[in-house]
């Protein structure tokens, strides 16, 4: 999903002055940064989250907060420390004048400061319900009583926890952090205050219309009666969950965040920390008919981000807007006219729509999967959700053209059996953010911490790119794509897989002088080829068109253009076997595909030859897709011939382990 630097407003204040004689001035050359929501109406100036550097202790946080207050007081400003964070992120929440930002950014330990902003419930119209008859018949859907080993935390509005549909299933915690309702004449009507949360609790675990009928839930109130909350309130809620987890460790935890605000670095960071503590976070993609990467927590890579589809598996339209989309969405789920508990009465049901409802479905599915396999990691759970989804059923024409390739065509589904998927080699495709158009621009795609990067490819709509390569970054491989002069930008595409006990490395061959092209193979004993990448420095590979042929009987070899450096991803893992599958079309084609057979998983996807009329290659589920320029611009020369190269792998070790369990 989103890289560290997203599309949000960043105000970097390079402050070097030593005024106030700070005893612990920031290290030379480091500059704390200020961030605020890019959506102006959602900004909450006057309240700021001051995030301190990672290893800062609670006592240092408190000292820094006191120092800020003292220095502000010397300037005649009143400040109020509203909360000191610890457990998830070090820092504090302060109410102060924006005039003090310069001062605050110079404090010791400060990493960045973010202005508070609003978050919103993602159901429409959640407080203008179309009441259905109080009796709802669930004859069609009777899932097993599932999710009983899992606790689902819901961060939402208040909820009517004794509604017949959810009675005894939801524990209302004493956590509440909500802003005042807008408008002087706002009338707090209990049933409206509870509407959003009650419905979602019913979708997750309701007796009649719930997905995981056995799941128990805990609710935290972070949204007010108008369905509005704050980033800071959500942060404090996430911290509350982490502290609860530390005080009383239970089984697997799922956190449902059916809300969205503008891109927030701090909210994404908190989600990352909680996810790395073993918590599964599920969030709404947002109802703005926009790129989900512009919203939080939807843009946090560690969060499972869910878009909404209807009964016909089409993206949900909500008034003039609709479900969000793009590379930050992991999958879609039902989110239109979803029946669930209504807070209008203790036995009423209602239909609501939105990405909140879609996220609640996935939280329920996650609870059932985790109840069946409590040891699943977040990466394993995400891969299973993707694997068991219905593929290629969404009509992509609804999405903006430039988002279609980035948006996963996946609709969540319960696995046919919650056990027995362990033998599969699971892989998913991760797209980077767009690089931007500058000559040296690059884009980076990363896998989750416990996934292996098995291959790397790139894509550019203009075709002007300089390929891609796998490189080490912070002890882990990443996929980096390179833009070319005159290009409009590139995407890096990582193929991220679950491969236990894997030992992977990248072998590189520099550009060859010989006319046969560049080749590289996996020479280490027991290592197999999982992916090929090529990267070149020249602006246009199309000026040299040598025939590039893969020598017969060389499955462990990558070949490419003689002016490109070629990178082979070579992995050793118990029982791992891979094979190369190619599909070449002699005539020019805008798209060439090759798929792996049943039982095999696509790990690598690349194009031969790597000439400039090839826009790039990427994996869609188990199919390798190679895109070329519009055939009308290439003509029917030999340059139009393109081969899609798929590397298909399976793990005999995983299959054997699964058989032993059964």
């Amino acid at each position: 999903q989103e890289d560290e630097d997203g599309d949000y407003e960043e105000l970097v204040l390079a402050l070097r002055s030593e005024e106030d004689g700070l005893a612990e001035a920031p290290e030379h050359g480091t500059t704390a940064t200020f961030h605020r929501c890019a959506k102006d109406p959602w900004r909450l100036p006057g309240t700021y989250v001051v995030v301190l550097k990672e290893e800062t202790h609670l006592s240092q946080s408190e000292r820094t907060a006191r120092r800020l207050q003292a220095q502000a007081a010397r300037r005649g400003y009143l400040t109020k420390i509203l909360h000191v964070f610890h457990g998830l992120l070090p820092g504090f929440l302060v109410k102060m004048s924006g005039d003090l930002l310069e001062l605050a950014l110079k404090l010791p330990h400060v990493d960045y400061i973010e202005e508070d902003s609003s978050v919103f419930a993602q159901s429409i119209p959640w407080n203008l319900e179309r009441i259905t008859p109080p009796r709802y018949r669930a004859d069609e859907y009777q899932p097993p009583d599932g999710g009983s080993l899992v606790e689902v935390y819901l961060l939402d509005t208040s909820i009517q926890s004794d509604h017949r549909e959810i009675e005894g299933r939801v524990m209302v915690t004493d956590f509440e952090n909500v802003p005042e309702e807008d408008g002087t004449r706002f009338h707090r009507q209990a049933s409206k205050c509870d509407s959003h949360g009650t419905h979602l609790a019913g979708v997750v675990s309701g007796r009649d219309a719930g997905v995981a009928k056995g799941a128990s839930m805990r609710s935290l109130r972070v949204l007010n009666c108008q369905g509005k909350g704050t980033v800071s309130g959500t942060l404090i809620g996430l911290e509350f969950i982490r502290k609860s987890q530390l005080v009383q460790p239970v089984g697997p935890l799922v956190v449902l965040l059916p809300l969205a605000g503008g891109y927030s670095r701090v909210l994404n960071a908190a989600c990352q920390r909680l996810a790395r503590a073993g918590v599964v976070l599920v969030t709404a993609a947002g109802n703005f008919r926009d790129d989900a990467c512009l919203y939080s927590p939807a843009s946090a890579p560690e969060v499972i981000t869910v878009g909404a589809t209807n009964a016909q598996d089409q993206p949900v339209t909500l008034g003039t807007l609709g479900t969000n989309f793009g590379r930050c969405v992991d999958l879609f789920a039902p989110g239109e006219d979803i029946i669930g508990a209504s807070s209008d009465c203790s036995t009423c049901f209602v239909s609501q729509s939105g990405t909140s409802q879609a996220a609640a479905h996935v939280a329920g599915i996650a609870a059932m999967m985790l109840s069946a396999e409590p040891e699943l990691t977040l990466a394993e759970l995400r891969q299973r959700l993707i694997h068991f989804s219905a593929k290629d059923v969404i009509n992509e024409a609804w999405f903006p053209e430039d988002q279609r390739v980035l948006t996963p065509n996946l609709v969540a589904a319960l696995p046919p059996s919650t056990h027995g998927a362990g033998w599969q080699l699971f892989c998913r495709t991760v797209w980077s953010a767009h690089s931007g158009p500058t000559r040296m621009a690059t884009a980076v795609a990363r896998c989750a911490p416990d996934e292996e990067l098995l291959s790397c490819s790139s894509f550019s709509r203009s075709g002007k790119r300089r390929g891609e390569r796998m490189e080490a970054q912070g002890g882990k491989l990443v996929c980096r794509a390179h833009n070319a002069f005159g290009g409009e930008g590139v995407y890096a595409i990582a193929r991220c897989c679950l491969l236990p006990q894997a030992n992977c490395s990248v072998h590189t061959a520099p550009p060859a002088e010989a006319s046969m092209g560049t080749r590289v193979h996996c020479h280490q004993q027991g290592h197999v080829l999982t992916g090929c990448s090529s990267h070149w420095e020249v602006e246009d590979l199309g000026t040299h068109k040598p025939p590039v042929l893969r020598p017969r009987g060389q499955p462990n070899q990558c070949v490419g253009h003689r002016e490109a450096s070629i990178h082979a991803s070579c992995c050793h893992a118990p029982g791992l076997e891979c094979k190369v599958k190619e599909h070449g079309i002699p005539a020019p084609q805008e798209q060439v595909t090759v798929a792996c057979e049943e039982g095999w998983t696509l790990t690598g996807c690349s194009a031969l030859p790597g000439t400039s009329h090839v826009l790039g290659a990427y994996a869609v589920d188990n199919t390798c897709v190679v895109r070329s320029r519009d055939v009308s611009t290439t003509g029917s020369t030999s340059e139009g011939a393109v081969t899609a190269v798929a590397i298909c792998c399976r793990s005999r070790h995983l299959a054997q382990a699964s058989q032993e369990l059964q």
Partner: antibody
Amino acid sequence: QVQLVQSGAEVKKPGASVKVSCKASGYSLTSYGISWVRQAPGQGLEWMGWVSFYNGNSNYAQKLQGRGTMTTDPSTSTAYMELRSLRSDDTAVYYCARGFGMDRWGQGTTVTVSS
Amino acid sequence: DIQMTQSPSSLSASVGDRVTITCRASQNINNWLNWYQQKPGKAPKLLIYGASTRPTGVPSRFSGSGSGTDFTLTISSLQPEDFATYYCQQWDDTPNTFGQGTKVEIK
């Protein structure tokens, strides 16, 4: 552990009112409402209604015809059932039970209506 | 209101017998059905909820089945402490309604 403790037996004259209490403990109060059920001597069980500890909302059986009121006091974890204009056929054991699902019951309160 | 019809209204059985009590709803109640056991002078005790789920502490000889309109309570091997009156109850719709009860007596 979950407990529902009801008030003691009552003897009332026809036309009078009775108020039975039910003190709940051992669970998250707001996660369940309280159902009231009565059982006339030698007869079966009859559901009278339900009341919420969360927001005080209630749900009555039609048969009570406005004679009954169910309330809760979250501060004392107590639910109340008041029955007015008592008649001899209101003689029964009155039970409180947890939630619509009635998974835990009070010990019962005997109400005798006699002139 | 949803009518709940229990049968038989009473039965005589011996210790060790397999006993089956049925309950029929006048309309579909999905699985929103509970079974209770009541002994003289005591409050009812929940035996089965959601048509087939046994709460903690209820002996495994008690089992429930059915969905929609027809439900069954089975006691696989009757024990001396099982002689009591059994009620089914629906909570699919308000008002919640009970069956008229089945009295299980010693033969």
